[in-house]
């Protein structure tokens, strides 16, 4: 029979290549039986995972699975890194595998503002 433990369906060593400036939704697929567990996202910093308290998250419910979504609106260059979701269930902590975001900064050297543009828009220097 199907297990009634909470299960988090993030693949081990999974990766996403995304562009800075675009919106992106990072999904944590969650399977549970009765009560939906409390789920959080954290970002790995070395061996510790720093909880993302102030980020926009939401739930998407489907028939056999639910998704706890971390929203990036938009993706920033420093969103690069590894993320993990965790579920609290009957005083057990269940951790997913980590998933890595590789952020490409579209403001590559060839697309940087010209000197003329910088002169007329000096705030670009401080973005």
């Amino acid at each position: 029979k199907e297990s009634c433990d909470v299960q988090l369906y993030i693949k081990r060593q999974s990766e996403h290549s995304i562009l800075a400036g675009d919106p992106f939704e990072l999904e944590c697929p969650v399977k549970y039986c009765a009560n939906r567990p409390h789920v959080t996202w954290c970002k790995l910093n070395g061996t510790t995972c720093v909880k993302l308290e102030d980020r926009q998250t939401s739930w998407k419910e489907e028939k056999n699975i639910s998704f706890f979504i971390l929203h990036f609106e938009p993706v920033l260059p420093n969103d690069n890194g590894s993320y993990r979701c965790s579920a609290n269930f009957q005083s057990n902590l269940i951790e997913s595998h980590s998933t890595t975001l590789y952020v490409t900064d579209v403001k590559s050297a060839s697309e940087r503002p010209s000197k003329d543009e910088m002169a007329s828009r000096p705030w670009l220097l401080y973005r």
Partner: antibody, heavy 119, light 112 residues
Framework: EVQLQQSGAELVNPGASVKLSCTTS????????IHWVKQRPEQGLEWIGR????????KYDPKFQGKATITADTSSSTAYLQLSSLTSEDTAVYYC????????????WGQGTLVTVSA | DVVMTQAPLTLSVTIGQPASISCKSS???????????LNWLLQRPGQSPKRLIY???KLDSGVPDRFTGSGSGTDFTLKISRVEAEDLGVYYC?????????FGGGTKLEIK
């Protein structure tokens, strides 16, 4: 019933390309990683790379980078291995393998495809 | 790359006797999630490989319990408590902790 059905044997000319297929059934291909493995005659196994059909992300052994291209089509539950600029060194049996990505719960192998590079 | 070294190269065993295969990795296979991603495969003559053991010691469904996997870090062992005729073939260890994933050179089990 779980199956990984690989395409038939190929005899190809040096310098040509070939595209092998691996059609999966009995599980959701998006829940797995698809690996491709090379086995030269009477030799051991060499890992070529793996594809995540859920998002297309692919990792290669650097020695196969530029030689191999791994893709997957989730609508047909089929994975592909394309080999380019073929030489006699590429004569081998190529296996696809599907490993569950979350909890390692299964690891299935196809029957293999023999590629012979010869003029 | 992680080098996987298997020993012995060939193993001749009498039916009903035990067998043991060693696999050593050039670096630890302990992943940051606390698990060790070491598989054992059997390739019977003329067939494709088949996974026997994953995560060092977990048996695949349908694999007889005469097979046991053990070890940690860089040292791993596959044991067969009583060899049967269907066990002949080449055994490979395979690590999928570090990219690129790598196989051992194989150990051929022959029946005496």
């Amino acid at each position: 019933e779980v199956q990984l059905q690989q395409s038939g044997a190929e005899l190809v000319n040096p310098g040509a390309s070939v595209k092998l297929s691996c059609t999966t059934s009995g599980f959701n291909i998006k829940d797995t990683y698809i690996h491709w493995v090379k086995q030269r005659p009477e030799q051991g196994l060499e890992w070529i790379g793996r594809n995540d059909p859920a998002n297309g992300n692919t990792k290669y052994d650097p020695k196969f980078q530029g030689k191999a291209t791994i893709t997957a089509d989730t609508s047909s539950s089929t994975a592909y291995l394309q080999l380019s600029s073929l030489t006699s060194e590429d004569t081998a049996v190529y296996y696809c393998a599907s490993y569950e990505g979350y909890y390692e719960r299964f690891g299935y192998w196809g029957q293999g495809t023999l590629v012979t590079v010869s003029a | 790359d992680v080098v996987m070294t298997q020993a012995p190269l060939t193993l001749s065993v009498t039916i009903g006797q035990p067998a043991s295969i060693s696999c050593k990795s050039s670096q630890s296979l302990l992943d940051r999630d606390g698990k060790t991603y070491l598989n054992w495969l059997l390739q019977r003559p003329g067939q494709s490989p088949k996974r026997l053991i994953y995560l060092v010691s977990k048996l695949d469904s349908g694999v007889p319990d005469r097979f046991t996997g053990s070890g940690s870090g860089t040292d791993f062992t596959l044991k067969i408590s009583r060899v049967e005729a269907e066990d002949l073939g080449v055994y490979y260890c395979w690590q999928d902790t570090h990219f690129p994933y790598t196989f051992g050179g194989g150990t051929k089990l022959e029946i005496k």
